[in-house]
Structures are given as C-alpha cells and as structure tokens.
Interface confidence: medium
C-alpha cells in the first residue's frame, strides 16, 4: 500500500489530525521535501546575522553577517569579527602581526617586510604591522628618472616563527 503522505509535496505536511490531508506549512515554517509529517521552523537571522534569503514554504531562510563580520561554519552558523589591518585570522581569532611582518588588508595573513638589502637598497621608511617597509635608492638608482621604491616581494609563507 502506498503511504498517502508520499503525495504531499514540498511546502506542505501530512496532517495526521486531518485524515492525512496535505496541509500547507504554517507561517514561518517550511518543508523542503515531499512526504513530510511536520514542517521545520524557519531560521531567524537576528543580531549580527542578517537575512540573505527569506524563508519560503519550501526552503529555509539563509543568513549572512552584518558589515564588519564574516561567516563561519556550515550555512553561516556563526559570525566572526573581521580582523583589522595589522592582524591576521588564526584559530584563536584575530591576532596582531608580530614584529617584522605586516598585513595591509582586513583578510589574509601577515607577511614579512621586504628585505631591502637583498636588492642592495636601504630602508627609506620603516615597516609597521599595517605597512611594508619602503626601500630607498641604491647608488644605481640615483640616476635621473629612476624609481626609488621597490615593489613588495612576492607573497611567500612567513615560516614557522614561534620557538
């Protein structure tokens, strides 16, 4: 015998109290598959969460995070504060870049300052947690029209610094 509930489409539930009639999901609930005996309560995006997609009778609401926060976990189950410049995201949250490294973005990792001496140049402006060093001219750069700023070195792994 076929289960009469199997005829109930998504957006409805099989109402045992009404002779297994397919009843529409009540407000603020949904069923995403057919043959359901109950409808699930819609997710509510509150506080630091904001609604990315409204709940419908056939699909749950989807949340994302308010500005200054980003999603973590499956289906944006958590919101975590964005890191600031001069910080990087670790498993223990946002942590300041250590001396000799910088991050000029709100995402990503702290990277080592450019080593000016590798290019035979001197440090014109010291680095900070938020900014790379600016390399000054080497003797060869003092000819007219030469640029005095070296572009940052390519991104590489900062290496395992803690001892």
């Amino acid at each position: 015998l076929q289960d009469p509930c199997s005829n109930c489409p998504a957006g409805t539930f099989c109402d045992n109290n009404r002779n297994q009639i397919c009843s529409p999901c009540p407000p603020n609930s949904f069923s995403s598959a057919g043959g359901q005996r109950t409808c699930d309560i819609c997710r509510q995006c509150k506080g630091v969460f904001r609604t990315r997609k409204e709940c419908s009778s056939t699909s749950n609401a989807e949340c994302d995070c308010t500005p200054g926060f980003h999603c973590l976990g499956a289906g944006c189950s958590m919101c975590e504060q964005d890191c600031k410049q001069g910080q990087e995201l670790t498993k223990k949250g946002c942590k300041d870049c250590c001396f000799g490294t910088f991050n000029d973005q709100k995402r990503g990792i702290c990277r080592p300052w450019t080593n000016c001496s590798l290019d035979g140049k001197s440090v014109l402006v010291n680095g900070t947690k938020e900014r790379d060093v600016v390399c000054g001219p080497s003797p060869a750069d003092l000819s007219p029209g030469a640029s005095s700023v070296t572009p940052p070195a390519p991104a590489r792994e900062p290496g395992h610094s803690p001892q």
């Epitope: 976990g73 250590c98 001892q163």
Partner: antibody, heavy 125, light 111 residues
C-alpha cells in the same frame, strides 16, 4: 634541525592496544598551535585522526576516532602520543605525526608544515 | 565532511598543464583555509599551497591554487618529471569544534 620522529609502531593483535610517540626537535611545543596525527592505510589516502593544542591541551578528533584513540602531550619532553585501543585490521596503516603551521604571532593556521617519516602499525592475528 | 578530488588519477606528459579540483561538502573555515600537499611513494606529504592560493616556501611557481568556500583548484602550469606524485587537498573546519579533513587524492602518472 627541525624534525618530527614517530616511534612505537609494529605488529599488534586485533583487540590489542598500542601507544605511538612523536618526538619533536628544533622547536618547542609551548605555543597555541596543534600537533596532529594522520594515518594512511596501504595504497589508500590520508586520513586525519586528531590534534592536540600544545598550549592548553585541548583535543580534537575525527568522529570515527573518538573513544578508541586518545592524543596526549608532554611539553617537557616535546613529545606527543597517540594511544590506540581495541585495534582492528582496518587500523593497519602508516601513522604520521604532523605539526600545524603557526602564524607570525604563534597561533594555529590550519595546515601542516612539518611531517614525520611515519611509523607502520600492522593489526593482524 | 566529505572532500572529493577529481580526477582520481590522470596521465600527462612533461610540459602539460594539469588541473586538479577539490570539492568540499561544507565551506572551509573563513572560506580559504584549504591546503594542497604532494606525496611520493614511501614519503610523507609535502606542503605546496596554503590558504587556498599561497605558495609554501621553496615550492616552484609553476604550482598555483585558487578557489573559495567549497570549490578549489590546484594547477601545475608546466608539468616537470619530479611532479609525478599523488596530490591531496586538506580543509580546516569549525562547527562545534575544529575539524580537519583530507581529499580523496589525485595520482598523476606519466602518459
């Protein structure tokens, strides 16, 4: 030299127990990143077992490993352990110790930048 | 959490461009906590790429990574003889607790 050396592998009967060790040299544990265990059955892929936070001792396990496998550490010896109980034939594998890379500030970054050479565990009667 | 790599194996020639994909059943932490490793027979894995697109120290620039969330790609721009190996992706996740997972692996062999 920075390295990890596993030991303690060998032949064990089904239902038996074994404790593997992972000795670290060239760096010290007292930081907030993890030391982890990963295994690889013969001819198969890598399988994460679990990790221990070298700072606060928190442990994290794969769902299949909970209950039978226990990770511990001795920071004074710079050594991490994997205690394996109720061993089965399907636990036969090379067991690797791996260090989670740390950020510039010394916190875990989620990927493994240093691996041991592995130790073979064979579960057979 | 399932991490599926495709293809599971491929044959290629030196100089070929090789692309391996990794699909996760859940978004990795911060959408980019994904790493790639190379493993040769009888050896431990070696880190190639971290945070989805950052080249690890000492890794040749012919290796590159891209992707975000659940879908990631490892590309070898011009395959070299030493690149014949098995490649694994690895994701880091946070739900109620920290969790790591490896992909199913892709074996790259000589055509």
């Amino acid at each position: 030299e920075v390295q990890l050396v596993e030991s303690g592998g060998g032949l064990v009967q089904p239902g038996g127990s074994l404790r593997l060790s992972c000795a670290a040299s060239g760096f010290s544990f007292n930081n907030d990143y993890d030391m982890c265990w990963v295994r690889q059955a013969p001819g198969k892929g890598l399988e994460w077992i679990g990790c221990i936070d070298t700072g606060d001792g928190s442990t994290y396990y794969a769902s299949w490993a909970k209950g039978r496998f226990t990770i511990s550490r001795d920071n004074s010896k710079n050594t991490v352990y994997l205690q394996m109980n109720s061993l089965r034939a399907e636990d036969t594998a090379v067991y690797y110790c791996a260090r989670e890379a740390a950020s510039s500030s010394g916190y875990g970054m989620g990927y493994f930048d240093l691996w041991g050479q592995g130790t073979l565990v064979t579960v057979s009667s | 959490i399932q991490m599926t790599q495709s293809p599971s194996s491929l044959s290629a020639s030196v100089g070929d461009r090789v692309t391996i994909t990794c699909q996760s059943s859940q978004s990795v932490y911060d959408n980019n906590w994904l790493a790639w490793y190379q493993q040769k027979p009888g050896k431990a894995p070696k880190l190639l790429i971290y945070r989805a697109s950052n080249l690890a120290s000492g890794v040749p620039s012919r290796f590159s990574g891209s992707g975000s969330g659940t879908d990631f790609t490892l590309t070898i721009s011009s395959l070299q003889p030493e690149d014949f190996a098995t490649y694994y992706c690895q994701g880091t996740y946070l739900s109620s607790n920290w969790y790591w997972a490896f992909g199913t692996g892709t074996k790259v062999t000589v055509l």
